[in-house]
C-alpha cells in the first residue's frame, strides 16, 4: 500500500519560518503534488503550492520556495508575518497524484514539544485518504 | 468542456482604468488558477502574474506590479484583471490562461486612445 | 529574471521539409532534484491564443501531432517539425517553465518557403 509521509520543521533562525517536507512511498509514478495548509486540500485547506514533475513549480504566499527533492519527495519553504504567518499548530497537508494508485494525502503539523531547529523524523502521518 | 471566456475589446482613455473579466467554465474554479498574459505586436508573450482562486492570493511580474492588480470572484467563477494609469504601451492583446498555461481564453484587446 | 533567447527570428521552409527553432535561457531550466527540464513551446497562429505544444522540454501535449517534437537540457533547447504541413505557418515562442516570472521567447515566425 502506497504512504505519503509529512515532516514539519520551525526554522531555528526566523521563528516565523517552517520547512515543510512531504514523500511519497510507492511505486507509482507521480502526476501531481498539492500542498496546502488548514486542512486537506478540497476540504477547507488552502493551497500553497503545485508541484508537477515535468510542467513545473506554482507556489503562493506565505510559499516561499517550493522544490521537488528526489523525484518522490518534495519541500516547501515558508516565511510568513501577520496574518498569513503560519503557527505552531498549524495543519500542512501534501496529496501526492500517481498512476496507478490514485491519489494519497497525508497532513502533519509541528510537534508539540519540538524546539526551533528540530523536527519529528520523516514518519508516514496519521491522516491518510486515498481518492 | 474547460473554457475560459473573455470580452473582445475595450477602448479606453489615457490616464483612465480598465478591469477585464475572465469567465471560467466546465472546472472547479477554485482548484485552478489563473494567469494573465500580454501580447504586443513584434514584442512577444509577456507573462503578467497569476492567482489562485482558493486562496484569493496573487503574484505578479515585479515588471506588471504597479499596473496590474489581480482579483476573482468564486460566486461566478470569473478572474479579474484591472489595469490602472492607461497609457499608449499598454495598447494590447491581454490573454487569462489556466493553470499551466495549457487553456487560454480568446484574449481581450484593449486599446488607449482619447 | 530568466532571459528567453529564440532563433532565428524568422523562418521559411518548403513544405515537407524539416524545420527547427532554437531556445536558450540564460539559466538553466533543469530542476536537479528530479531531472526534469521546465521548458514548454507554444504554437500561435493568425487570429488565435497560444497552443500548448510541447511540455517538460520534449513531452507532447494531448492532441498534438508527432511531426512535433522537443528535445534539449539545462540552457539549449529546440522544437523540430519533421515534415512541415501548411496548418503549421503560425510563430512559436519557448517559455520558461522553471522560475517566476514565466518569462517567453521574443517569437519565432514560421513561413512557406
Known amino acids: 500500500t502506497p504512504e505519503v509521509w509529512v515532516q514539519v520543521r520551525m526554522e531555528a533562525t526566523e521563528l516565523s519560518s517552517f520547512t515543510i517536507r512531504c514523500g511519497f512511498l510507492g511505486s507509482g509514478s507521480i502526476s501531481l503534488v498539492t500542498v496546502s495548509w488548514g486542512g486537506p486540500n478540497g476540504a477547507g485547506g488552502t493551497t500553497l503550492a503545485v508541484l508537477h514533475p515535468e510542467r513545473g513549480i506554482r507556489q503562493w504566499a506565505p510559499a516561499r520556495q517550493a522544490r521537488w527533492e528526489t523525484q518522490s519527495s518534495i519541500s516547501l519553504i515558508l516565511e510568513g508575518s501577520g496574518a498569513s504567518s503560519p503557527c505552531a499548530n498549524t495543519t500542512f497537508c501534501c496529496k501526492f497524484a500517481s498512476f496507478p494508485e490514485g491519489s494519497w494525502e497525508a497532513c502533519g503539523s509541528l510537534p508539540p514539544s519540538s524546539d526551533p531547529g528540530l523536527s519529528a523524523p520523516p514518519t508516514p502521518a496519521p491522516i491518510l485518504r486515498a481518492d | 468542456q474547460v473554457q475560459l471566456q473573455q470580452p473582445g475589446a475595450e477602448l479606453v482613455k489615457p490616464g483612465t482604468s480598465v478591469k477585464l473579466s475572465c469567465k471560467a467554465s466546465?472546472?472547479?474554479?477554485?482548484s485552478y488558477w489563473i494567469n494573465w498574459v500580454k501580447l504586443r505586436p513584434g514584442q512577444g508573450l509577456e507573462w503578467?502574474?497569476?492567482?489562485?482562486?482558493?486562496?484569493?492570493?496573487?503574484n505578479y511580474n515585479e515588471k506588471f506590479k504597479n499596473k496590474a492588480t489581480l482579483t476573482v470572484d468564486t460566486s461566478s467563477s470569473t478572474a479579474y484583471m484591472q489595469l490602472t494609469s492607461l497609457a499608449s504601451e499598454d495598447s494590447a492583446l491581454y490573454y487569462c490562461?489556466?493553470?499551466?498555461?495549457?487553456?487560454w481564453g480568446a484574449g481581450t484587446t484593449v486599446t488607449v486612445s482619447s | 529574471d530568466i532571459v528567453m533567447t529564440q532563433s532565428p527570428d524568422s523562418l521559411a521552409v518548403s513544405l515537407g521539409e524539416r524545420a527547427t527553432i532554437n531556445c536558450k535561457s540564460s539559466q538553466s531550466l533543469l530542476s536537479s532534484g528530479n531531472q526534469k527540464n521546465y521548458l514548454a513551446w507554444y504554437q500561435q497562429k493568425p487570429g488565435q491564443p497560444p497552443k500548448l505544444l510541447i511540455y517538460?522540454?520534449?513531452t507532447r501535449e494531448s492532441g498534438v501531432p508527432d511531426r512535433f517534437s522537443g528535445s534539449g537540457s539545462g540552457t539549449d533547447f529546440t522544437l523540430t517539425i519533421s515534415s512541415l504541413q501548411a496548418e503549421d505557418v503560425a510563430v512559436y515562442y519557448c517559455q520558461n517553465d522553471h522560475s517566476y516570472p514565466y518569462t517567453f521567447g521574443q517569437g519565432t515566425k514560421l513561413e512557406i518557403k
Open positions: 490562461a489556466g493553470g499551466y498555461f495549457d487553456v
Open positions: 517538460g522540454a520534449s
Open positions: 466546465g472546472y472547479t474554479f477554485t
Open positions: 503578467i502574474g497569476d492567482i489562485y482562486p482558493g486562496s484569493y492570493i496573487p
